[in-house]
Interface confidence: medium
Amino acid sequence: FKVTTPYSLYVCPEGQNATLTCRILGPVSKGHDVTIYKTWYLSSRGEVQMCSERRPIRNLTFQDLHLHHGGHQAANTSHDLAQRHGLESASDHHGNFSITMRNLTLLDSGLYCCLVVEIRHHHSEHRVHGAMELQVQTGKDAPSNCVVYPSSSQDSENITAA
């Protein structure tokens, strides 16, 4: 499988909500010995490899935000977490995988990475990530709603397999 990022750039006004999305394309293994681990984190455009640095999103680490299940199951973080930090990560049966951030502030700007790891208990592993940028703007030049910019086909597939 691979991960695509439908949009590479989100430009949003302060106070708005934004949902950043990754999409898993292709077959995901099924079986009792298969684990799918998905998460989100903030990163930077590293010189060696994008998304290799992991920073918290609103003080929540990639461990706090992870989803864990088998195959293309639906899952999401608790509403309690969303209420306390204005964040919710979710995935559906169709491979869509998102994080919603409520009441954006300028501090939310940055490079967001989604990570999907498929482990067939230590026989093999497949790890993919996608990256997208969020720019939160304020003032008269800020858009009234989020404006999203589609990824080029080259950028939208970020495949890293071990």
């Epitope: 684990t35 681990y37 490899q49 290799s52 640095e53 992991r54 680490t61 461990q63 706090d64 935000l65 992870h66 989803l67 864990h68 899952a75 999401n76 973080t77 608790s78 309690d80 977490l81 790891v117 482990i119 208990h121 230590h122 026989h123 093999s124 592993e125 790890r127 071990a162």
Partner: antibody, heavy 120, light 112 residues
């Protein structure tokens, strides 16, 4: 067979540093976090931290930040832990342990342990 | 840090008896994703710990079905339905819901 082979016992003087190793075999080394656990006097267990061997990303127990440094060498499937500014409090058995589910925090394979003794 | 409190410290049993070990956490171990990351290990004398139960009630591969885990929130129990000689050692509960991961102080299962 999945194995974690740890380096031998170490006797060090206070103030010194020590680097212990954990060589993985029989599985995809980069597929799971490698954890390090300290055991005092055969009783309590303390989680020191872990490292994602693929990215080299580390998560530490705040208590061991500045004391322990975790690294990996992917080419030899080996994880390392360096302990610095040793004191008698660091005398313990140190285990490396593989995360069963990538990064979920339960460990299905453990090394045999490396005994570190700090004594003048 | 989450404090894991195990009781009893020592549990003398006769072979064939049922044994029960309690583990209590200082805060809920329900992760934001709904899973509860509470695990049990057995450490036999002179050996490394071995995983018995993960995520409250899932027996690790090769672990006999006389071992069972239960509980929720902050209170968890490991039960051994019929103790055998090979079950003797120190049992540790552990949580990985919150970083840093923490372990209980251990319960020593010994022959009466």
């Amino acid at each position: 067979e999945v194995q974690l082979q740890q380096s031998g016992p170490e006797l060090e003087k206070p103030g010194a540093s020590v680097k212990i190793s954990c060589k993985a075999s029989g599985y995809s080394f980069t597929g799971s976090n490698m954890n390090w656990v300290k055991q005092n006097n055969g009783k309590s267990l303390e989680w020191i931290g872990n490292i994602d061997p693929y990215y080299g990303y580390t998560t530490y127990n705040q208590k061991f930040k500045g004391k322990a440094t975790l690294t990996v060498d992917k080419s030899s499937s080996t994880a390392y832990m360096q302990l610095k500014s040793l004191t008698s409090e660091d005398s313990a058995v140190y285990y490396c342990a593989r995360d069963y589910d990538y990064a979920l925090g339960y460990f299905d394979v453990w090394g045999a342990g490396t005994t570190v003794t700090v004594s003048s | 840090d989450v404090v894991m409190t195990q009781t009893p410290l020592s549990l003398p049993v006769s072979l064939g008896d049922q044994a029960s070990i309690s583990c209590r956490s200082s805060q809920s171990l329900v992760h934001s994703n709904g899973n509860t990351y509470l695990h049990w290990y057995l450490q036999k004398p002179g050996q490394s710990p071995k995983l018995l139960i993960y995520k409250v009630s899932n027996r690790f591969s090769g672990v006999p079905d006389r071992f069972s885990g239960s509980g929720s929130g902050t209170d968890f129990t490991l039960k051994i339905s019929r103790v055998e000689a090979e079950d003797l050692g120190v049992y540790f509960c552990s949580q990985s819901t919150h970083v840093p991961y923490t372990f209980g102080g251990g319960t020593k299962l010994e022959i009466k």
